[in-house]
Structures are given as C-alpha cells and as structure tokens.
C-alpha cells in the first residue's frame, strides 16, 4: 500500500479467484484512543471499532473510502483505490490501445520543435468518475525537471457504437537545449483514476524522435508565363525552431488530381518554391520534414490549381 | 447508456439445470464487466459471480462455486449463467448487471441493471 496523495491510498493487488487478498491496516488520524468506529462509504455498518482498523483487500468491494467517528463525529477518511495485477500484467483496463505506432501504445506524444515543448494525448471510452494526474522528467535516475499542465478533454468522437473521448496534457521541459545532442530520454508518467481503480501508464522518448513540424504557411502559386507550369512557393511554419539555417526542414510537393486514383507527381526539395506542373482540378499540397533526422512529416498545407 | 434484458427464468426440480441469458444493446457492450446478482422475497441482493470484459477471468461467490458458470459472447452482446445441481435456495429474482470493476461482489459497483428473471426450485 501506498499514498497516491493526501489520504488517499493505493492498494497493489496481485489477483486470481480465491487469492488471499492483501492485509491492510488503516489507522485513524486522531489523538482520541477511544470510543471510535469505523463505516465504509455512505454506509452506516459499523466494521470495525479501534484507533486501528485491519481489513484484508481481496476486490473493490473492498475499496472505498472508510471514515472512522466518535461520538457521531467525523475524525478522518482514508480512500482506498486498488491497482490491480492480473497473471502477472498491470491493468490497463482505462486507457485504449491506439495501437500505433505499435501495439500497447496507450500515450502518443508529439513536438513542434526543439523548445522542450510537447503535447501527449491518450483515448478512453470512459465518460466519467475519471481523473489523471501527469508528470514528467528528463532521466529517471538523476531526473531533470519537465512541468506538464493539467490533462484537459480535447476531442469526442463516435466510433461504431462507441464515443470515444481524447484527453491531452502539454509538458515544458524546464532548462531545455534546443541545439543538444539528447542523450537521456523524457519519461512520461500518467496515474488513471477511474472510480475506485488506479492504473499508471508510462512513455519513454527523445524530442528528436517525437518532432512533427507544423504545415509550412503561406502556401502560394504564380503561374509561368505561356506554361502549364506554376511557381509553389511557402514559408517554414511559425512554429518551427530557430534559426532555420539550423533547424533546417526538407518539403514533398504533391500534385494530386481530383480523383484519389489519379497519378501522383511528387517532388522533394530542401528550398522553399519549386515548379512543377498544374493540372485541371488538381491541387498542390506541400508537407515538411526535419531535413537532417527522420521524424515525422508534418500534415499537408494544400492549394487548389484553378 | 446500456439497456440489458434476462431471459432463460422458469421453474425446474432441484438436482437439474438451467441457463440464463442477458442480453445488451446500447453501447458497446465489450467495455463492461458483467455480473450476476440475486435477491429472494425478504432479502438482500446478493452477488452471484461476474465476468471480466473480454471473458477471461470469472469470479463467484462461495455460495454457487462449482455449480454456477458466467460466460459471455461479445460478438452477440450477451452473458450467460449457467446454473447446474441447483437446489431450493437458489430460488430468487436473478438480475444481470454491468460495470467498470472486476472483480467486486458489491452491487453499486455495477452502473446498469436488467429488470430480472425468477428461477424457482422445487423441492
């Protein structure tokens, strides 16, 4: 057992059927020795009477929040959760497996740039009596500090007969290095409280490995004098690090057709224009990289040709 | 919101069998834990047994070990009780229900409720 935070208390529980439970002993905050009762929840059955109360935790029925009284007054409340082990595995019963980009992939995070900023998100199909509580660091064992904000409700959406909700946190790293070579990884640590159960999910990353740079802006065509052919020419988005000379980004120029099953033409230059061939009710679409490591791309900022 | 209907309820002999069924609609029926309660004329809703949500791991009370078995098919939204060797004092009202925690005998762990199903055994 231990304390999640100010009287309340987290119960590991390694469970199969007819397992022994976990013996827990609960002691009530008080410097009254007699006359003191204790009830679980809105209960008013008394379980037990005593400064201390030994419970064995073999289920949530077992978890709540016990209060010990005296005399019809209140003294103080311990709120048991359970974070529960099955077959050896850590519940993950909160969060939903987004699956990529592999398999039990629960935090997905991203960055624009190299500042020490960055954005985690994760889904659930829970609605409600849910909670997350988000910290961060850089290393584990001589941590340097990250400061994340509060997790906050992003998006819903409906899939299949399911809604879905998407929650993300923003994170600072606290003494970033934009032009450092990394070489301890984030940590990411986000504790789930879902009514009475506790979960802790877990995410390890380099900045450079989470970068997704905003769309390049500004995105423009000026048509060739007697030519089918256009200028495109964009800016590096806002949002990217400074300067560019350094934090330099790589762009695809698309051309696409109306129709999916059109040809694509594609182009990979490292300026910020190329020419290329406009076609009727085609359109131009322009995405960027980081030019020296593979991350990922960024979305793509489009234009029609017309 | 989750909508569940029991069926399968009746009167048998006691030593014989039954199975009850409890059937979803609503939303996706795979998020929930699933269980089985039962309250006879004069007493508490007592716990029966419940599934966990993908239908690996099973949990009973003392009192139907042996003789009772959950099962569920998350393809067709449906739990099943499977009652065997009943005797006279598994007769009650048998309610389904679904939840978020797994396991817990503790009926207000369970969010939704079917409206229930009699199992009568005679002696």
């Known amino acids: 057992i231990w304390e999640l935070k100010k009287d309340v208390y987290v119960v590991e529980l390694d469970w199969y059927p007819d397992a022994p439970g976990e013996m827990v002993v609960l002691t009530c905050d008080t410097p009254e020795e007699d006359g003191i009762t204790w009830t679980l929840d809105q209960s008013s059955e008394v379980l037990g009477s005593g400064k201390t109360l030994t419970i064995q935790v073999k289920e949530f029925g077992d978890a709540g929040q016990y209060t010990c009284h005296k005399g019809g007054e209140v003294l103080s409340h311990s709120l048991l959760l359970l974070h529960k082990k099955e077959d050896g595995i850590w519940s993950t019963d909160i969060l939903k497996d987004q699956k990529e980009p592999k398999n039990k992939t629960f935090l997905r995070c991203e960055a624009k740039n190299y500042s020490g900023r960055f954005t985690c998100w994760w889904l659930t199909t829970i609605s409600t009596d849910l909670t997350f509580s988000v910290k961060s660091s850089r290393g584990s064992s001589d941590p340097q500090g990250v400061t994340c904000g509060a997790a906050t409700l992003s998006a819903e959406r409906v899939r299949g007969d399911n809604k879905e909700y998407e929650y993300s946190v923003e994170c600072q790293e606290d003494s970033a290095c934009p032009a450092a070579e990394e070489s301890l990884p984030i940590e990411v640590m986000v504790d789930a409280v879902h009514k009475l159960k506790y979960e802790n999910y877990t995410s390890s990353f380099f900045i450079r490995d989470i970068i997704k740079p905003d769309p390049p802006k500004n995105l423009q065509l000026k048509p060739l004098k007697n030519s089918r052919q256009v200028e495109v020419s964009w800016e590096y988005p806002d949002t990217w690090s400074t300067p560019h000379s350094y934090f330099s980004l790589t762009f695809c120029v698309q051309v696409q057709g109306k129709s999916k099953r059109e040809k694509k033409d594609r182009v990979f230059t490292d300026k910020t224009s190329a020419t290329v061939i406009c076609r009727k009710n085609a359109s131009i679409s322009v995405r960027a990289q980081d030019r020296y490591y593979s991350s990922s791309w960024s979305e793509w900022a489009s234009v029609p040709c017309s | 919101e989750v909508q569940l209907v029991e069926s399968g309820g009746g009167v048998v002999q006691a030593g014989e069998s039954l199975r009850l069924s409890c059937a979803a609609s609503?939303?996706?029926?795979?998020?929930?834990?699933m269980g089985w309660f039962r309250q006879a004329p004069g007493t508490e809703r007592e716990f029966v047994g419940s599934?966990?949500?993908?239908?690996?791991?099973?949990y009973y009370a003392d009192s139907v070990k042996g003789r009772f078995t959950i099962s569920r098919d998350n393809a067709k939204n449906t739990v099943y009780l499977q009652m065997s060797s009943l005797k006279p004092e598994d007769t009650a009202v048998y309610y389904c229900a679904a939840g978020w925690l797994y396991p817990s005998s503790r009926s207000r762990d369970y969010d939704y409720w079917g409206q229930g199903t009699q199992v009568t055994v005679s002696s």
């Open positions: 599934i966990n949500r993908r239908g690996s791991s099973t």
């Open positions: 609503g939303r996706s029926f795979s998020n929930y834990e």
